[in-house]
Amino acid sequence: SGVFQLQLQEFINERGVLASGRPCEPGCRTFFRVCLKHFQAVVSPGPCTFGTVSTPVLGTNSFAVRDDSSGGGRNPLQLPFNFTWPGTFSLIIEAWHAPGDDLRPEALPPDALISKIAIQGSLAVGQNWLLDEQTSTLTRLRYSYRVICSDNYYGDNCSRLCKKRNDHFGHYVCQPDGNLSCLPGWTGEYCQQPICLSGCHEQNGYCSKPAECLCRPGWQGRLCNECIPHNGCRHGTCSTPWQCTCDEGWGGLFCDQDLNYCTHHSPCKNGATCSNSGQRSYTCTCRPGYTGVDCELELSECDSNPCRNGGSCKDQEDGYHCLCPPGYYGLHCEHSTLSCADSPCFNGGSCRERNQGANYACECPPNFTGSNCEKKVDRCTSNPCANGGQCLNRGPSRMCRCRPGFTGTYCELHVSDCARNPCAHGGTCHDLENGLMCTCPAGFSGRRCEVRTSIDACASSPCFNRATCYTDLSTDTFVCNCPYGFVGSRCEFPVGLPPSFPW
């Protein structure tokens, strides 16, 4: 679809005569008839296949024709066509004399024709005007013409329809050849596809308008490249949605069980070495001079009674010092200057000579100790009670008073709160320092796993065609992430095939 435009510029009829040679009275009031038709080697009679147009009276005898396009007037003359421009044409322009106001052919005098021109040729679509001048014996006509495409038509022959748009069906303008030129942020054959935010993950993200990145279920982040872990996951991460892969030192379904109490809480004091011994359980190995569950108590070095043979111990800044009784010497008064002849063994101890009488050894009766049997046995000296238990002397024996949560002769055993199987629905019981904790299976919660919560919706393998199943524990539902070529809530339909239902 396009328009053949004809711009009449000047008509010269100096003598004011008709084609018959007869003069016009009083002058030739001139109007034009134009016929545009398909190319003919010889311009022939017949329909004006590309259209006709007539002008009003434009002037008398000789005159210039005013360009009246701005006022919506009749110059240039418009000959619209609604087919592919063939590139060739025949053009007939007739100048007629109209004595009165009626320009119909039957109303004109028999010899009203002033002049007639007929041209044929080729003409490409374009903005440039072709200037032409036709001269006969008595008249001259100067004019120009061109072919331009109608609005929304493009190409060499105005055959390509292209209407710019910015809506659901496309976002584009039209190039001079009629091809689409997408608006910024759009792509695709018809510019219907938004260009998502740069870096937006191809599979996990999408967009409905340019520079957007909307995440598919199970994904988050500005570029939808971060998976969403299991709801309630505390100290864990994921590589695919709804996972909860525990960080080092954490365990349990939600990675909220502390398996590395030593690192996370540093309970051991005074440079003691900490060893993990179970969930929220640890043991501190104290440096010399310290005691207590957490090695928080400073020991006097004399508390271990290092001085032998009745020597007395004195604490010093850098250790201790033994003051030996007469007849003894050495760091711990361990060397004797006495022999059995000196009756050195107290409390009924019997003396045995050694090294040919140069030394001796005392064999002590029960309840006495020391190199000279001079000490009553204190069974708590070796600190035999574990886990902070208090040692008590009871005559010939000793006993440990245990801290809550511990039992056994030496408080070496945890009191097992788990012994009575307090965790319901197959929950796993863990002893804690002050109580217990239940790790519940999927679908149960509460301190004793007594509350039914959600189930693993993926357990039944609802997704087809090797789709990946993600459980959303917050809603007890599953989401199937389809591989390429499959669609449907369970990825059950191949793309392009309508579902067939059994009913």
């Epitope: 084609a19 018959s20 008839r33 016929c35 038709k37 398909h38 010889v42 311009v43 022939s44 009679p45 017949g46 329909p47 004006c48 296949t49 590309f50 006709t52 087919f83 007939i92 007739e94 007629w96 004109l108 028999p110 010899d111 009203a112 024709l113 007639k116 007929a118």
Partner: antibody, heavy 119, light 111 residues
Framework: QVQLVQSGAEVKKPGASVKISCKAS????????IHWVKQAPGQGLEWIGY????????NYNQKFKGRVTFTTDTSTSTAYMELRSLRSDDTAVYYC????????????WGQGTLVTVSS | DIVMTQSPDSLAVSLGERATISCRAS??????????MKWFQQKPGQPPKLLIY???NQGSGVPDRFSGSGSGTDFTLTISSLQAEDVAVYYC?????????FGGGTKVEIK
């Protein structure tokens, strides 16, 4: 009143020539074309060709080309057809008719001229 | 050349009845949406008279009972109510290509 008046009947010997006239009135002669049409006795119509009264451009039916010539005289608004090397099968009524670029068709016809070719 | 074939060769119709004449071209006579087809009426001893041009347009002074239709290769002239003065030979003619050609004619008579 548009009129096309043709010259009278002609009797010619084989091999001779004949020139028929068609005088136009009542319209602008130079704006139109003049067609020539043959009708043999008891037969249908046969198109011979046309001439543009404006510039003298012609278009002939190949069947008659070489034996026929169209001319016009704009000063007298008259068209002519000359047919040479006459044969007996040229015996026919010859019509002139006017036509225009804006396709009404051959809307006015002359009354016809009978040409008889006989030895 | 484009050959124009008319049918029937002759047609006898009662007064006031419909008469239909067909014309088939050996190739399409349409160009740029226009049919280069005309119909003429010729009464005995008279020149032909233009009835229809461009397949369906009535010539000047032609009665409304004459109508034309068709496109491409098949065309029809219809006389909706035959009158005594309609007795004549009717010709179709194409002007798409030189040489312009006429159909063989259809003779319409009163039954």
């Amino acid at each position: 009143q548009v009129q096309l008046v043709q010259s009278g009947a002609e009797v010619k010997k084989p091999g001779a020539s004949v020139k028929i006239s068609c005088k136009a009135s009542g319209y602008s002669f130079t704006a139109y074309y003049i067609h020539w049409v043959k009708q043999a006795p008891g037969q249908g119509l046969e198109w011979i060709g046309y001439i543009s009264s404006y510039n003298g451009a012609t278009n002939y039916n190949q069947k008659f080309k070489g034996r026929v010539t169209f001319t016009t005289d704009t000063s007298t608004s008259t068209a002519y057809m000359e047919l040479r090397s006459l044969r007996s099968d040229d015996t026919a009524v010859y019509y002139c008719a006017r036509d225009y670029d804006y396709d009404v068709g051959m809307d006015y016809w002359g009354q016809g001229t009978l040409v008889t070719v006989s030895s | 050349d484009i050959v124009m074939t008319q049918s029937p060769d002759s047609l006898a119709v009662s007064l006031g009845e419909r008469a239909t004449i067909s014309c088939r071209a050996s190739e399409s006579v349409d160009n740029y949406g226009i049919s280069f087809m005309k119909w003429f009426q010729q009464k005995p001893g008279q020149p032909p008279k233009l009835l229809i041009y461009a397949a369906s347009n009535q010539g000047s002074g032609v009665p409304d009972r004459f109508s034309g239709s068709g496109s491409g290769t098949d065309f029809t002239l219809t006389i909706s109510s035959l009158q005594a003065e309609d007795v004549a030979v009717y010709y179709c003619q194409q002007s798409k290509e030189v040489p312009w050609t006429f159909g063989g004619g259809t003779k319409v008579e009163i039954k």
